[in-house]
Each structure stands twice: as C-alpha cells, then as structure tokens.
C-alpha cells in the first residue's frame, strides 16, 4: 500500500492551525497513528508529540478506495515560544512502519508577526497578527 | 449495549438557533461516523450531514452547509446539531444515527429516538 | 448528488402476500444501498445492508438484490407488522441520500 502524509497550516484570526494530512487505505489505517512534534529531530515518537490522532477507518462512504485522516493542532494566538521546528509524522503499532513528513518552522519576528516555512503546498507563508491576512 | 439518547423537544422562533444534542453510550464514539437525519410531519427522510469525531471531520448536504454546524465532544461521547436561522420549513424530527464500520455494516445501525423542533411564531 | 426513486410509493397487500419494493440510484452505486423500515412514531431500522446482506435479528422473510442502479428489496409472505413504511439510502458518495419511501399498507 501506498500512505502519503503532507503538512499545512491555515489561520483564523489571531488562530494558527498546523495541519496534518495523513492518504491511506481502508485496510491500512488499523494500528497507525500520525503525531505533531515540535523541535525533535530524532526522537518523534507519538509519546513525545503535541498531539495524535488514531487513523480514519471508515471514510464514511462505500465508493472510494482512499481515506484522508487529519489533525488539526490549534495555537490560539502565536507567542515566541511556539517558534521552532515542526513535523508531521505517522506510525504503525502493528507493522512498526514509520513515516516522516517534511519540517516545517515557525519563525516568530520581532514586530510580532510570524512566518512559516518549509511548507511543500505553499512554500512559504507570512502571517501578521495585526492585520489577521496572510501576506 | 449501543445507545444514542437525544435532548428532549424544542419549540423556537422563526430567526432563531436550536442545538440538540446526542449522547453516546456502548462503543468507541470516536471510530464512528454520526449522521444527523430529519423528518418532516408526513415526509421522508432527509439527511443533513454527518461527523467523524475522531478527527471533527464533518460532511454536510449543500442545502443545510452554512446554517448547519455539526461538532462533537469526545470526552463525553456527545455530538451535537445546530441550526441557526430557523424557518417553519424546519419543524420536524432531527435524528442522530452511528454509520456502522464500511464493508461491514455501512448503514445506519443504530438511531436516537428523535428530538422534535417546532418552529413557530 | 445521487437521486434516489423508490416505487411504488404506495404497496396495498394483504398478510401473507409478497411485497416487492422498488429502489433506482440516478448513476451506479455498486452495492453501496441499505434499506429501512420506519414505523409510526419511531425511528427507522436497518433491514438490510449492502443491496442483499441480511442484518442480525432481522426475520429471514426479508430480502435484497440488485447492483449498478436497480435495487429490489422483497418481503417473502407479510407479516402484520410489517405494515410500514420503508427507504432505502445510499452510501456510496457525498451526499448521502434516502428515497423517497414506499408505504405498506394492508389491503
């Protein structure tokens, strides 16, 4: 089987959601889990991580053969200590397969605007907390 | 045993919002998809959307996306429904039911006995 | 969205008659269809799952069949209690949609 796990990020508002977007199989999804860590080159480990999230095992209709689990971590309003690397990773309790989706950093500026980058669907996205737009 | 108790009858205004909620009792609510259904006096059944609690991932029909918000609490194994802006067309029976696990099951296997919402002036 | 037309709307049988009840997907649905039943006053039951999958407790007089776009769910000799009203939904792509129903009502 073939499961795909990309990182993305939205904002609402003063929000910042780090999303992580996990492509698998029906049958694929028993067992495996995808986490959020944060500065853990090494060590990523769903015990270590900012939050899991059990994979989808319905897609809730009949006539599809992929499912899309995602989670969602939430940062109500981006401080200095958020700044930091970031990556999406998926593992399987049964098979111990594992897999590492791309970094990603939050760079929090002086002016009290935040960047993140590393982004593979938008290479580099620039947040400003007094206008809440991206730019 | 699997259970899905709704919040009792409502009686709102035209322009108002109702929220019912549906508890769940006798499973793993968040491996699930809940589906919410109504039935208006003499009709049949129409489906509203429905939300996987697992990750809040939730599916609506185009008729009721904007004014329908369907969410759950995992730590209470509680999905809720609301509707905003409410119009008598909206007077009927709202309805959660649990989609059992696809191949599987698939269908609806379980439902709430019904919250009845009036929406009159 | 896949539409959903069950026929006829209204079944006039007597106990112990066969009732066959008629289900049509506006584009093919696999085996992606269930059907219920729904009584007065209560909410609806799953009869069957998958177009002809029996569901436990369910009387074995109780049927479906059918695949792609026409579906059939039959009652072998009706019950008394069978009068009722039944739909059949589908699950195979958003939006989920129901029939319309087919009343069983006694002759």
């Known amino acids: 089987g073939c499961i795909n796990i990309t990182s993305s990020a939205s904002q609402e508002g003063t929000r910042l959601n780090l999303i992580c977007t996990v492509w698998h199989k029906k049958e694929e999804a028993e067992g495996f889990v995808v986490f959020l860590c944060k500065d853990r080159s090494g060590d990523c480990s769903p015990e270590t991580s900012l939050k899991q999230l059990r994979l989808k095992r319905d897609p809730g209709i009949d006539g599809v053969g992929e499912i899309s689990s995602q989670l969602m971590f939430t940062i109500s309003q981006v401080t200095p200590l958020h700044s930091g690397t970031y990556q999406c990773c998926a593992r399987s309790q049964k098979s111990g397969i594992r897999l590492q989706g791309h970094f990603f950093s939050i760079l929090f500026t002086e002016t009290g605007n935040y960047t993140v980058t590393g982004l593979k669907q938008r290479q580099h996205l620039e947040f400003s907390h007094n206008e809440g737009t991206l730019s | 045993q699997v259970q899905l108790v709704q919040s009792g009858a409502e009686v709102k205004k035209p322009g108002a919002s109702v929220k019912v909620s549906c508890k769940a009792s006798g499973y793993t609510f968040s491996d699930y998809w809940m589906q919410w259904i109504r039935q208006a006096p003499g009709q049949g059944l129409e489906w509203i959307g429905a939300?996987?609690?697992?990750?809040?991932?939730?599916r609506y029909t185009q008729k009721f996306r904007g004014r329908a918000t369907l969410t759950a609490d995992k730590s209470t194994s509680t999905a809720y429904m609301e509707l905003s802006s409410l119009r008598s067309e909206d007077t009927a029976v709202y309805y959660c039911?649990?989609?059992?696990?696809?191949?599987?099951?698939?269908?609806?296997?379980?439902w709430g006995q019904g919250t009845t919402l009036t929406v009159s002036s | 969205e896949i539409v959903l037309t069950q026929s006829p709307a209204t079944l006039s049988l007597s106990p112990g008659e066969r009732a066959t009840l008629s289900c049509r997907a506006s584009?093919?649905?696999?085996?992606?269809l269930h059907w219920y039943q729904q009584k007065p006053g209560q909410a609806p039951r799953l009869l069957i799952k998958y177009a002809s999958q029996s569901i436990s407790g369910i009387p074995a007089r109780f049927s479906g069949s059918g695949s792609g776009t026409d579906f059939t769910l039959t009652i072998s000799s009706l019950e008394p209690e069978d009068f009722a009203v039944y739909f059949c939904?589908?699950?195979?792509?958003?939006?989920?949609?129901f029939g319309g129903g087919t009343k069983v009502e006694i002759k």
């Open positions: 039911a649990r989609r059992g696990i696809a191949a599987v099951v698939g269908g609806f296997d379980y």
């Open positions: 939904q589908q699950s195979n792509s958003w939006p989920l949609t």
């Open positions: 939300i996987y609690p697992g990750d809040d991932d939730a």
């Open positions: 584009q093919s649905i696999s085996n992606h």
